[in-house]
């Protein structure tokens, strides 16, 4: 169900788009992204738009996880799929609090 959750939750915020260590949104996010030839990076934050990103399957380059309780993204660890290189790397979307 991609309907926007009505209740706001507090989330851990650790990404280049965070003003402070926490944010408030409709859900919490954890994004693991690996750019070609570089180490994977983990971003934690909030989501309010583009909830379809939560449904994406993990790939070799991106894993986008969403959860719906306050600070549920604080200790989540993600892994990337060990698949063949796709023709295009997906773009990571992080929501500013």
């Amino acid at each position: 169900d991609l309907a926007k959750p009505s209740k706001l939750v507090n989330c851990t915020c650790e990404s280049p788009h965070c003003k402070r260590p926490f944010c408030q949104g409709s859900w919490c996010t954890v994004v693991l992204v690996r750019e070609q030839g570089r180490h994977p990076q983990v971003y934690r934050g909030c989501g309010s738009l583009n909830q379809e990103l939560c449904l994406g399957r993990p790939t070799e380059f991106l894993n986008h996880h969403c959860c719906y309780r306050s600070f549920c993204n604080h200790n989540v660890s993600l892994m990337l799929e060990a698949t063949q290189t796709p023709s295009e790397e997906p773009e990571v979307d992080a929501h500013l609090p």
């Epitope: 990404s15 280049p16 738009l49 583009n50 992080a94 500013l96």
Partner: antibody, heavy 113, light 111 residues
């Protein structure tokens, strides 16, 4: 690749108006808050305004509130800055920035009589 | 006058470690993340440090950030000639409800 391309700068007389545009590509524009930051010649960076993902929240630096208006069109992947009642002290390079990581190359606004 | 205070200049020789300070208040650095940007001559600012001490991918680990109370610092170790640039700290300010920058520090690599 994230790209931000500003346009609309130029020479304008005091009291005049300009509308700056910033064309975004390489990312889902509607997922990010955006800012305008300016830099007067030989000076430091000064934040101008920002706007949230859907355009419902806007913040301005006090000295520009009322004269400048930030807006966005997510269907066109474009950020705007409408500047009215321009003064000589508004002369600067204006940068469009994805909060808080990527910046465009800037567009020069010169206010002179 | 900038809300965040930085020294106007700093210098060092190749291989040295240089530190640039950034002083603020409880409404900005004290309660929010600190960011550091590098601006090479004639170019747009580039993000060096976010979230007080995190590096975006592609930024060398010679650059490190720290924060304590209402002050922050950027350290550059193994100084190189290509590090010669202006460095700016930034943070969100809850009182002003806006982003504030330091006045910038011009780093000169001697010799």
């Amino acid at each position: 690749e994230v790209q931000l391309l500003e346009s609309g700068g130029g020479l304008v007389q005091p009291g005049g108006s300009l509308r700056l545009s910033c064309a975004a590509s390489g990312f889902t524009f509607s997922s990010y808050a955006m800012s305008w930051v300016r830099q007067a010649p030989g000076k430091g960076l000064e934040w101008v305004a920002n706007i949230n993902q859907d355009g419902s929240e806007k913040n301005y630096v006090d000295s520009m509130r009322g004269r400048f208006t930030i807006s966005r069109d997510n269907s066109k992947n474009t950020l705007y800055l409408q500047m009215n009642s321009l003064r000589a002290e508004d002369t600067a390079v204006y940068y469009c920035a994805r909060e808080f990581d990527y910046w465009g190359q800037g567009t020069l606004v010169t206010v002179t009589s | 006058q900038s809300v965040l205070a930085q020294p106007p200049s700093a210098s060092g020789t190749p291989g040295q470690r240089v530190t640039i300070s950034c002083s603020g208040s409880s409404s900005n650095i004290g309660s929010n993340y600190v960011y550091w940007y590098q601006q090479l001559p004639g170019t747009a600012p580039k993000l060096l440090i976010y979230g007080n001490n995190k590096r975006p991918s592609g930024v060398p680990d010679r650059f490190s950030g720290s924060k304590s109370g209402t002050s922050a610092s950027l350290a550059i170790s193994g100084l190189r000639s290509e590090d010669e640039a202006d460095y700016y700290c930034a943070a969100w300010d809850d009182s002003l409800n806006g982003r504030v920058f330091g006045g910038g520090t011009k780093l000169t690599v001697l010799g």
